[in-house]
């Protein structure tokens, strides 16, 4: 008799999840010499230990601490690029602007990017059928808690001038319910971070609006200023200049050093 299984509203664990995490870890540590010491089997064991046999609505940041410890990584704190609702372009940017880093350019972010995972209470099985949806089921699910944990740590590590790429084509350019708005903004350290500079990326070719005057940007400015961090906003046009660089990442046009 097949055992009854909880049906969640979200998609199930990404197929071949263990193999994918392990393979990504091996690839990352091969490419990044400073992480060559990392034992990928231990990383997988710690990752698995965070959610296997646990109720997928009762995951805590504490569950991920062993993984966090193994994935400890130092990135230049003044070269951090945060993003909200514009992941692909942010990644294209750091792909070519090699001295800047998004969370997904770090080991832990790279391991989990675009993946879904969850387990079941009291069984060692991974649930490939469904996982909790953040809105419809619960917020303390394995994926949400993971990203909250790594995002908080990433923001805490930032210093000097921190950049954030925002999507100027969305109705809410700054969304206080996004990971950036709900986690990262509140974990930038005023003692270390001098300025948050927002890059508002325009979509339309003929767009000449000043999106830095958008009410949601004013809201972001207010939040940041109250935290004693300076705020700057820049309109960024012609994002096709980024896309060209993805085709030719080695090209000299793909670095801001003139």
């Amino acid at each position: 008799v097949p055992r009854w299984r909880q049906q969640w509203s979200g998609p199930g664990t990404t197929k071949r999840f263990p193999e994918t995490v392990l393979a990504r870890c091996v690839k990352y540590t091969e490419i990044h010499p400073e992480m060559r010491h990392v034992d990928c089997q231990s990383v997988w064991d710690a990752f698995k230990g965070a959610f296997i046999s646990k109720h997928p609505c009762n995951i805590t940041e504490e569950d991920y601490q062993p993984l966090m410890k193994l994935g400890t990584q130092t990135v230049p704190c003044n070269k951090i690029l945060l993003w909200s609702r514009i992941k692909d372009l942010a990644h294209q940017f750091t792909q070519v602007q090699r001295d800047m880093f998004t969370l997904e350019d770090t080991l832990l972010g790279y391991l989990a990017d675009d993946l879904t995972w969850c387990g079941e209470f009291n069984t060692s099985k991974i649930n490939y059928q469904s996982c909790p949806d953040w809105r419809k089921d619960c917020s303390n699910n394995p994926v949400s808690v993971f990203w909250k944990t790594v995002s908080r740590r990433f923001a805490e590590a930032a210093c000097d001038v921190v950049h954030v790429m925002l999507n100027g084509s969305r109705s809410k350019i700054f969304d206080k319910n996004s990971t950036f708005g709900s986690v990262e903004v509140h974990n930038l350290q005023p003692e270390k971070v001098q300025t948050l500079e927002a890059w508002v990326i325009h979509g339309g070719r003929e767009d000449s609006r000043d999106l830095c005057q958008d009410p949601t940007i004013k809201e972001l400015e207010s939040i940041i200023s109250k935290r004693n961090i300076q705020f700057s906003c820049k309109n960024i046009y012609r994002p096709d200049k980024f896309l060209q660089c993805v085709k030719n990442p080695e090209d000299s046009s793909c670095t801001s050093e003139i």
């Epitope: 767009d207 609006r209 906003c233 309109n235 046009y237 012609r238 060209q244 046009s253 801001s256």
Partner: antibody, heavy 120, light 107 residues
């Protein structure tokens, strides 16, 4: 090193046409937005036109829209400016300029310029 | 379209600090670029992205941008810095604008 060399300037009557060229070398031409900027005698700089790396996107200043056409031939590393219905106020030194990368929109390198004189 | 306003001229004694302003509505929301042009020569980029210096440009050149005003600062001005200086910004589409230029005289 980066080199931009303009040619094609000269004396032309009002209403006439002229085609400027800019030969680029020392960088991957097909990876950059390119621009034309002009400077009337004793006056300031005025941006004229821009073209994307693949030539699909073109921008023009209001003062030249409908009269000037920017184009490029990436196989020849050459930028062009076709100028029609020329007016006396188009008299200027015309510079070819290479765009800055990524989030920046300014001019990293300039040619030495070619003089266009519109007079009867 | 944004309009950029520069003082027509600025004078400075050698070794002193020269400041050239460039003002426009909400200029802080756009990156500003500065060019140096000597008589009979093409312009040269001296500052990009508000405050970044291209390689080969002396450290005495610096830039800032806040409120409605961007400023080019030349500390320890030298005779060779005498030139016309232009600010420039881009506000999307076909809106790429230069300031009217400032003639810097080193006394």
């Amino acid at each position: 090193q980066v080199q931009l060399v303009e040619s094609g300037g000269g004396l032309v009557q009002p209403g006439g046409s002229l085609r400027l060229s800019c030969a680029a070398s020392g960088f991957t031409f097909s990876s950059y937005y390119m621009n034309w900027v002009r400077q009337a005698p004793g006056k300031g700089l005025e941006w004229v036109s821009a073209i994307s790396h693949d030539g699909n996107v073109k921008y023009y200043a209001d003062s030249v829209k409908g009269r000037f056409t920017i184009s490029r031939d990436n196989s020849k590393n050459t930028l062009y400016l076709q100028m029609n219905s020329l007016r006396a106020e188009d008299t200027a030194v015309y510079y070819c300029a290479r765009d800055l990368p990524l989030v920046y929109t300014g001019f990293a390198y300039w040619g030495q310029g070619t003089l266009v004189t519109v007079s009867s | 379209d944004i309009e950029l306003t520069q003082p027509p001229s600025v004078s400075v004694a050698p070794g002193q600090t020269a400041r050239i302003s460039c003002s426009g509505d909400n200029l802080r929301h756009y990156y500003v670029y500065w060019y140096q042009q000597k008589p009979g020569q093409a312009p040269v980029l001296v500052i990009y992205g508000d405050s970044k210096r291209p390689s080969g440009i002396p450290e005495r050149f610096s830039g800032s941008n806040s409120g409605n005003t961007a400023t080019l600062t030349i500390s320890g001005t030298q005779a060779e810095d005498e030139a016309d200086y232009y600010c420039q910004t881009y506000t999307g589409g076909a809106s790429l604008v230069f300031g009217g230029g400032t003639k810097l005289t080193v006394l």
